[in-house]
């Protein structure tokens, strides 16, 4: 049974509030042999990172004004650097910090 924040390589969408603390874990991808490493491409803006073992996280607070949606691709590679699975689309939607707290002009 895979947990809520871990699982196989498949297309996914995540919503993240802008301005949140960086270095937050988004998802842990699990490799199926012979896949041993993961690779992230697309609109990473050097913010999104995937570790070889499949841990996807972001290392800077997101800014919705800069980019409201990040279209990424994740692939699983074998020991020879050849793609075994993917690349699959991973969509990161950046949510407005004010979405849940509407303010009204007087």
């Amino acid at each position: 049974q895979e947990g809520k924040f871990s699982g196989p390589l498949k297309p996914m969408t995540f919503s993240i509030y802008e301005g949140q603390e960086p270095s937050q874990i988004i998802f842990q991808f699990k490799a199926n042999p012979p896949a041993v490493t993961f690779e992230l491409t697309g609109e990473t803006d050097n913010i999104f990172v995937i570790e070889r073992e499949g841990l996807l996280y972001y290392n800077r607070a997101l800014d919705r004004e800069t980019r409201s949606t990040h279209n990424l691709q994740v692939a699983a590679l074998d020991a020879n650097g050849i793609i075994v699975e993917g690349p699959v689309p991973i969509t990161i939607k950046v949510k407005d910090i004010n979405d849940n707290r509407p303010t009204f002009l007087q």
């Epitope: 012979p34 650097g81 050849i82």
Partner: antibody
Framework: QVQLQQSGRDLVKPGASVKISCKAS????????INWVQQRPGQGLEWIGW????????YYNEKFKGKATLNVDKSSSTAYMLLSSLTSEDSAVYFC?????????????WGQGTTLTVSS | DIQMIQSPSSMFASLGDRVSLSCRAS??????LDWYQQKPGGTIKLLIY???NLNSGVPSRFSGSGSGSDYSLTISSLESEDFADYYC?????????FGAGTKLELR
């Protein structure tokens, strides 16, 4: 020097099986992958799959699953490809090629090819 | 599967000519492309690996370039032993796929 010596030409009947060999010399057999490639008459090259002699692990092109079976005999540094349920479509030249393990995975040495003819 | 389209399928050239052979992938392959030469006798030899790296023992008149999905092999000055079939191979993703080949013939 590195050499891959393949078995000679084969003439077999439809429905039969055949085992093609590829004897490696001049390097440590268990450190490199052995790839197999098909070339039909007058056609291009098609990758069948690889075997890593060090562990015996294999990876097949889906198209050849059930048709080709790869194995090795480490004691004689020989790789084998068994082709089963042969039809005229399997008539081709089959090459073995050494694959450098890790990245980049290029095929730096090739066997001379084994011609297989399937005919009744 | 990634399709590899080679062009031209055949070409005629003369000794001393500079020729370029093309290989286009159906999607980006991150430079994971090799070039092989097959002589009329069937012998296959690695020329270039990873787009532009010359295999040891291969004459410097051979060179490779490209990125994304478009790649090429150039022979700067044809010699008699260069008339052969040339194949590109992508090893970016399984299954590994070859182009259909370019036959280089003496004019």
């Amino acid at each position: 020097q590195v050499q891959l010596q393949q078995s000679g030409r084969d003439l077999v009947k439809p429905g039969a099986s055949v085992k093609i060999s590829c004897k490696a010399s001049g390097y440590t057999f268990t450190d490199y992958h052995i790839n197999w490639v098909q070339q039909r008459p007058g056609q291009g090259l098609e990758w069948i799959g690889w075997i890593f002699p060090g562990s015996g692990s294999t990876y097949y092109n889906e198209k050849f699953k059930g048709k080709a079976t790869l194995n090795v005999d480490k004691s004689s540094s020989t790789a084998y490809m068994l082709l089963s349920s042969l039809t005229s479509e399997d008539s081709a030249v089959y090459f073995c090629a050494r694959g450098k393990s890790g990245y980049p995975f290029y095929f730096d040495y090739w066997g001379q090819g084994t011609t297989l003819t399937v005919s009744s | 599967d990634i399709q590899m389209i080679q062009s031209p399928s055949s070409m005629f050239a003369s000794l001393g000519d500079r020729v370029s052979l093309s290989c286009r992938a159906s999607q980006g392959i991150r430079g994971n492309l090799d070039w092989y030469q097959q002589k009329p006798g069937g012998t296959i030899k690695l020329l270039i690996y990873s787009t532009s790296n010359l295999n040891s023992g291969v004459p410097s008149r051979f060179s490779g370039s490209g990125s994304g999905s478009d790649y090429s092999l150039t022979i700067s000055s044809l010699e008699s032993e260069d008339f052969a079939d040339y194949y590109c191979l992508q090893r970016n993703a399984y299954p590994l796929t070859f182009g259909a080949g370019t036959k280089l013939e003496l004019r």
